[in-house]
């Protein structure tokens, strides 16, 4: 998490700031949602525990042509220590159900808010 620059400021961003900015982006997506997010695309749900940021990116990166989540994809890549490409699923990513992107974003947002309140920024 030492290389989270480029989202809002030129230098490295403290983890708390990066997490807050990610939460703000997800709030923005959910509040500005008029039509179904990403036209109802479905993605693999994830286990919101260890390795969550990489798992979230692995799931969302498969959705292309959805400008609403492009910034989220970029921001998540800053939290994931390894490069993620479409079609890549780590062992942490159990493929048991698919949900709409809108639900995925809501679930992720609720969990990140909880982490932020608890001071878990990494």
């Amino acid at each position: 998490l030492t290389c989270l620059g480029g989202f809002a400021s030129p230098g490295p961003v403290p983890p708390s700031t990066a997490l807050r900015e990610l939460i703000e982006e997800l709030v923005n997506i959910t509040q500005n949602q008029k039509a179904p997010l990403c036209n109802g695309s479905m993605v693999w749900s994830i286990n919101l525990t260890a390795g969550m940021y990489c798992a979230a990116l692995e799931s969302l990166i498969n959705v292309s042509g959805c400008s609403a989540i492009e910034k989220t994809q970029r921001m998540l890549s800053g939290f994931c220590p390894h490069k993620v490409s479409a079609g890549q699923f780590s062992s942490l990513h159990v493929r048991d159900t698919k949900i709409e992107v809108a639900q995925f974003v809501k679930d992720l947002l609720l969990h990140l808010k909880k982490l932020f309140r608890e001071g878990q920024f990494n």
Epitope: P36, C38, N39, G40, S41, M42, V43, N62, V63, S64, C66, G87, R95
Partner: nanobody, 116 residues
Framework: EVHLLESGGGLVQPGGSLRLSCAAS????????MDWVRQAPGKGLEWVST????????YYADSVKGRFTISRDNSKNTLYLQMNSLRAEDTAIYYC?????????WGPGTLVTVSS
């Protein structure tokens, strides 16, 4: 352009079987992950099943596990869903989808009604 057309739906009694087909064109079918998704009357979308491009990976919603089987014939650009032991709660419009694409790329769907 992605084009998908489902067929095989109809009226069936509880405990009966149906086989849905989906003819695909406009994209490289054999390298695409494919989904079946359904929408029951007055309900939201529900993911049913996914098959990987290589046919090695098949995944099912808990509600259909052990009853439904997804398969594909890459030589025919066709996706299938074999549905056995059908229940009233399986009544829905079934859509074939190229994974990770929005509804504008889905087919029109095929209606499955399970009723006695």
């Amino acid at each position: 352009e992605v084009h998908l057309l489902e067929s095989g739906g109809g009226l069936v009694q509880p405990g009966g079987s149906l086989r849905l087909s989906c003819a695909a064109s406009g994209f490289t079918f054999d390298s695409a992950e494919m989904d079946w998704v359904r929408q029951a009357p007055g309900k939201g979308l529900e993911w049913v099943s996914t098959i990987s491009p290589s046919r090695r990976g098949t995944y099912y919603a808990d509600s259909v596990k052990g009853r439904f089987t997804i398969s594909r014939d890459n030589s025919k650009n066709t996706l299938y869903l074999q549905m056995n032991s059908l229940r009233a709660e399986d009544t829905a419009i079934y859509y074939c989808a190229k994974a990770y694409t929005g509804r504008s790329y889905w087919g029109p769907g095929t209606l499955v009604t399970v009723s006695s």
